[in-house]
């Protein structure tokens, strides 16, 4: 039995350019899209993803002393070089001389659970999203973003931290997942692949997208990141897939045009403030949501993931710039900085729209739709 397909509700249709580009058969995972040994699969494969800043990590005009016990950028594990069998490359961040932090890398030693035991947790991220198994949850209202349109001044810090490119956000960017679920944006960063190889962290029915943006938020119930780590709903990440489109994305160009300045691992530059919401899809009402973890050590759980149904379009040149400009330590490229998808282990992914109404060839047999856990909210 096949469920009727509703074109306008097709999961992950169309980029924020406004085109209707639902995942069609050509988007089904191919052999190349399936995890392979050289793709960063497996538990050890997290990128140095969430270089989560605490309040102290927001852009400072001058250095200031850190509060005792507060979580600093440097307090989180850093990434050491992965390798790709085809070419020397890496998505890596080497600790500064004298640092005694854990090192970790994609697809190699040490195993991530040894770096942080939480990486062996049962509710990890990223995951494969299967829209037909998602629970339609009408209680999931459109996301609300406030203060995301930043003026050009003050400038923002854009940094190659060795495992991603990260933009530190100033105070005042507020996001609500719903009533009483309020957050403050801290930073955003990207995940990408390499030439001809997609690099999103989340996948949709096994399909990996070219790249993915993460905007990391701290719950207003917590003053600092270290207090929120591991607490349910303490952190929230907005995630969107980046796809190839016909035109240059002017919002992304404001960041991508600056990557050459930070090609070297550990380097940073200042960029004019911009409209952060323009980096996200325009449709804030259609998304998938589940509880997971940071996708890098410390892999803390309790993170609320919101993955937009709509994708963002970048030109082929822009996607190439993203995947081919930055370097990790030594002579290794910063590429393929994504963690393999993790098992759901019984978790239900909720959808803010009826994503399961779909009769694609992927649903050849009857599917048991999950019910919305928050239906009574």
């Amino acid at each position: 039995q096949r469920l009727p397909r509703m074109q306008e509700d097709s999961p992950l249709g169309g980029g924020s350019s406004g085109e209707d580009d639902p995942l069609g058969e050509e988007d089904l995972p191919s052999e190349e899209d399936s995890p392979r040994e050289e793709d960063p699969p497996g538990e050890e494969d997290l990128p140095g993803e969430e270089d989560l800043p605490g309040e102290e990590d927001l852009p400072e005009v001058k250095p200031k002393s850190e509060e005792e016990g507060s979580l600093k950028l440097e307090d989180l594990p850093t990434v050491e070089a992965p390798g790709d069998p085809q070419e020397p490359q890496n998505n890596a961040h080497r600790d500064k001389e004298g640092d005694d932090q854990s090192h970790w890398r994609y697809g190699g030693d040490p195993p991530w659970p040894r770096v942080s035991p939480a990486c062996a947790g049962r509710f990890q991220s990223p995951v494969d999203i299967r829209p037909q198994l998602a629970a339609f949850c009408p209680a999931l209202r459109p996301l609300e973003l406030l203060g995301f349109q930043l003026p050009p001044l003050p400038e923002l810090r854009l940094r190659n931290n060795g495992h991603s490119v990260q933009l530190t956000l100033p105070p005042g960017l507020e996001m609500a997942l719903g009533p009483g679920r309020e957050y403050r944006a801290l930073q955003l960063h990207l995940h990408w692949g390499a030439a001809g190889r997609p690099g999103s962290e989340h996948t949709v029915e096994g399909h990996r997208f070219p790249a993915e943006i993460h905007v990391v938020h701290l719950s207003t119930a917590f003053a600092r990141v270290d207090e929120a780590l591991g607490r349910p709903g303490g952190l929230a990440v907005l995630a969107a897939f980046l796809e190839e489109g016909p035109e240059e994305n002017s919002a992304y160009e404001q960041l991508l045009s600056r990557l050459e300045e930070i090609a070297e691992e550990g380097s940073e530059t200042q960029v004019p403030g911009l409209d952060i919401s323009a980096l996200l899809p325009s449709d804030f009402s259609r998304y998938f949501q589940y509880e997971g973890s940071l996708t890098t050590p410390p892999c803390a759980q309790g993170v609320i993931w919101t993955v937009f149904n709509q994708t963002v379009m970048l030109s082929a040149k822009q996607l190439h710039t993203l995947s081919d400009t930055l370097w990790g330590p030594g002579d290794s490229r910063l590429q393929l900085n994504f963690r393999a998808t993790q098992p759901l282990n019984g978790r239900v992914i909720e959808a803010s729209f009826p994503a399961g109404v779909d009769s694609s060839p992927r649903a050849a047999e009857p599917v048991q739709l999950n019910s919305c856990l928050a239906a009574g909210d």
Epitope: P151, P152, L153, Q270, P272, D275, A278
Partner: antibody, heavy 124, light 107 residues
Framework: EVQLVESGGGLVQPGGSLRLSCAAS????????MHWVRQAPGKGLEWVAF??????????QYSASVKGRFTISRDDSKNSLYLQMNSLKIEDTAVYYC???????????????WGQGTTVTVSS | DIQMTQSPSSLSASVGDRVTINCHVS??????LSWYQQKPGEAPKLLIY???NLHTGVPSRFSGSGSGTGFTLTIRSLQPEDYATYYC?????????FGQGTKLEIK
């Protein structure tokens, strides 16, 4: 009175060098980003470079047309801005203006105080 | 780079006329646009910042409007001292770019 006074312009051969100076007065120089903007004879305005204030690390930014050839610098103790111009080309011929830009309290870069300009002529 | 296109390139008007100059921007710059006036042999002067804010000391006959990609400078009642060249400039991101200028001449 808020004032910017440029000096150092002149005639130079292609490939040569020149150093422009700008003396600022009447405002807290250290607070501001400072720019150089130029205007070729009979043409429009072209932004050349800026240098951030102390709070933002004094880091510079250049237009593509001068990057690698020109160097902007400042000396807050002397309330002075400089533009070192090397490998000069005929197309660098212009009036060069010292301009005050944004600062910590600004929302964006607008150029609210301009010097009178100094003329640079690159010719063989 | 963000491209700025002013129209018209030149115009003739009489004292007392209402004059409008347009500036089209190649991408959305919100309200981060300024207008400048330059007279021959002088440095430019800031008239309007943030699309519509009048700079200190600028006569109230000057006004600015617009946001996104389209902006307008209006001179309500032209005065003899207003004959000059006018430039728009984006302050969204560097390289900062100016329009090519609009020369306002006496009719």
């Amino acid at each position: 009175e808020v004032q910017l006074v440029e000096s150092g312009g002149g005639l130079v051969q292609p490939g040569g060098s020149l150093r422009l100076s700008c003396a600022a007065s009447g405002f807290t120089f250290t607070d501001y980003y400072m720019h150089w903007v130029r205007q070729a004879p009979g043409k429009g305005l072209e932004w050349v470079a800026f240098i951030r204030n102390k709070a933002s690390g004094y880091t510079p930014q250049y237009s593509a047309s001068v990057k690698g050839r020109f160097t902007i610098s400042r000396d807050d103790s002397k309330n002075s801005l400089y533009l070192q111009m090397n490998s000069l080309k005929i197309e660098d011929t212009a009036v060069y203006y010292c301009v005050r830009g944004g600062h910590a309290g600004s929302n964006y870069w607008y150029f609210d105080v301009w010097g009178q300009g100094t003329t640079v002529t690159v010719s063989s | 780079d963000i491209q700025m296109t002013q129209s018209p390139s030149s115009l003739s008007a009489s004292v007392g006329d209402r004059v409008t100059i347009n500036c089209h921007v190649s991408q959305n710059i919100n309200v981060w646009l300024s207008w400048y006036q330059q007279k021959p042999g002088e440095a430019p002067k800031l008239l309007i910042y943030q699309a519509s804010n009048l700079h200190t000391g600028v006569p109230s006959r000057f006004s600015g409007s617009g946001s996104g990609t389209g902006f307008t400078l209006t001179i309500r009642s032209l005065q003899p001292e207003d004959y000059a060249t006018y430039y728009c400039q984006q302050g969204q991101s560097y390289p900062f770019t100016f329009g090519q200028g609009t020369k306002l001449e006496i009719k």
